[in-house]
C-alpha cells in the first residue's frame, strides 16, 4: 500500500484552487490572482475570463471557478456561457449586418431579438383576418367568410373544457 | 492570447477628424467581420460601424454616414475608424470589437472587444 502511494503521482493531491508547481518541488501552490483551477491535481492555473466591453460581469473569477459574463444592456447573450453579445433591435425590427431594420410588409417580429416572419394567413385556415398584421404584431385571424353571413353568429362557441396541464394541439 | 487594443483617441474641437485604430493579436485577424461600437455618456452601447474580412462590404449607422470611415488592413492585423465633420454628440468611449464565428450566416453576435478610447468633441 506504502509502495502504491509513493508512486502516485503527487500533483493528484493538489485541491482545487491550486496547482502542481514543477518548480517548486510539484508542491501545490495557490493559484496566481486572475487565474482559477477548477478541479484538483492541474499543473497550471487557467486565466480567468475578462468581462470587456458589452460583458458585464456576472460572477467574479475565484481561485476555484471562472467568472461569468452576461451583456450590458441593450445587447443580449448567444453561445454557451456567454460566449458572444448580440444587438436588441426595437419590436417591428430584425438585427442584419447593417444593422436594426424594420421588418419588411408582411412581416412582424414582437421581440427585441430573432428575425421578422410573415403574418398567418388566416385563408389557409379558412378564416378572415379579424385584425390586421402590423410590424409588431401578427394578424388576429377570425371566423371564416361563410360563418359572417346575414344571421350567422360571429361569436366563437366556448371551447370544450381541457384538463389543466394539456394545451391545444 | 486573442486581444484588441484601441488608441487614437483624445480631445478634438467640433468639425474636427481623429483616427482610431484597433491592433488585433492572438486569432486570425483576415478571417473575422470586424466592428466599432461606441458608448455615450449616460447611454447604452451603440454599434457605430462594421467591415467583413476583406473590407469590401462596410455598413455604417445613420448617425455617422458619410462622416466616418471605416477600414482594415489584414497585413498589419489592424481595424481603423476615420472620423471627419465631429460633432459633440460623437463623445463616447469607442471599442473594436470582433464578431463571432460564424458572423452573419448564423448569427449578429460578437466575443472580443477591447478595452475602449475615449473620444471627447468640445470647443
Known amino acids: 500500500f506504502e509502495r502504491t502511494r509513493s508512486l502516485q503521482d503527487p500533483c493528484s493531491n493538489c485541491p482545487a484552487g491550486t496547482f502542481c508547481d514543477n518548480n517548486r518541488n510539484q508542491i501545490c501552490s495557490p493559484c496566481p490572482p486572475n487565474s482559477f483551477s477548477s478541479a484538483g491535481g492541474q499543473r497550471t492555473c487557467d486565466i480567468c475570463r475578462q468581462c470587456k466591453g458589452v460583458f458585464r460581469t456576472r460572477k467574479e473569477c475565484s481561485s476555484t471557478s471562472n467568472a461569468e459574463c452576461d451583456c450590458t444592456p441593450g445587447f443580449h447573450c448567444l453561445g454557451a456561457g456567454c460566449s458572444m453579445c448580440e444587438q436588441d433591435c426595437k419590436q417591428g425590427q430584425e438585427l442584419t449586418k447593417k444593422g436594426c431594420k424594420d421588418c419588411c410588409f408582411g412581416t412582424f417580429n414582437d421581440q427585441k431579438r430573432g428575425i421578422c416572419r410573415p403574418w398567418t394567413n388566416c385563408s389557409l385556415d379558412g378564416k378572415s383576418v379579424l385584425v390586421n398584421g402590423t410590424k409588431e404584431r401578427d394578424v388576429v385571424c377570425g371566423p371564416s367568410p361563410a360563418d359572417l353571413s346575414p344571421g350567422a353568429s360571429s361569436v366563437t362557441p366556448p371551447a370544450p373544457a381541457r384538463e389543466p396541464g394539456h394545451s391545444p394541439q | 492570447e486573442v486581444q484588441l487594443v484601441e488608441s487614437g483617441g483624445g480631445l478634438v474641437q467640433p468639425g474636427g477628424s481623429l483616427r482610431l485604430s484597433c491592433g488585433a493579436s492572438g486569432f486570425t485577424f483576415s478571417n473575422y467581420w470586424m466592428f466599432w461600437f461606441r458608448q455615450a455618456p449616460g447611454k447604452e452601447l451603440e454599434w457605430v460601424a462594421n467591415v467583413n474580412q476583406d473590407g469590401s462590404e462596410k455598413y455604417y449607422v445613420d448617425s455617422v454616414e458619410g462622416r466616418f470611415t471605416i477600414s482594415r488592413d489584414n497585413a498589419k492585423n489592424s481595424l481603423y475608424l476615420q472620423m471627419n465633420s465631429l460633432r459633440a454628440e460623437d463623445t463616447a468611449i469607442y471599442y473594436c470589437?470582433?464578431?463571432?464565428?460564424?458572423?452573419?450566416?448564423?448569427?449578429?453576435?460578437?466575443?472580443?472587444w477591447g478595452q475602449g478610447t475615449t473620444v471627447t468633441v468640445s470647443s
Open positions: 470589437a470582433r464578431g463571432g464565428e460564424g458572423y452573419s450566416d448564423s448569427h449578429y453576435g460578437t466575443d472580443v
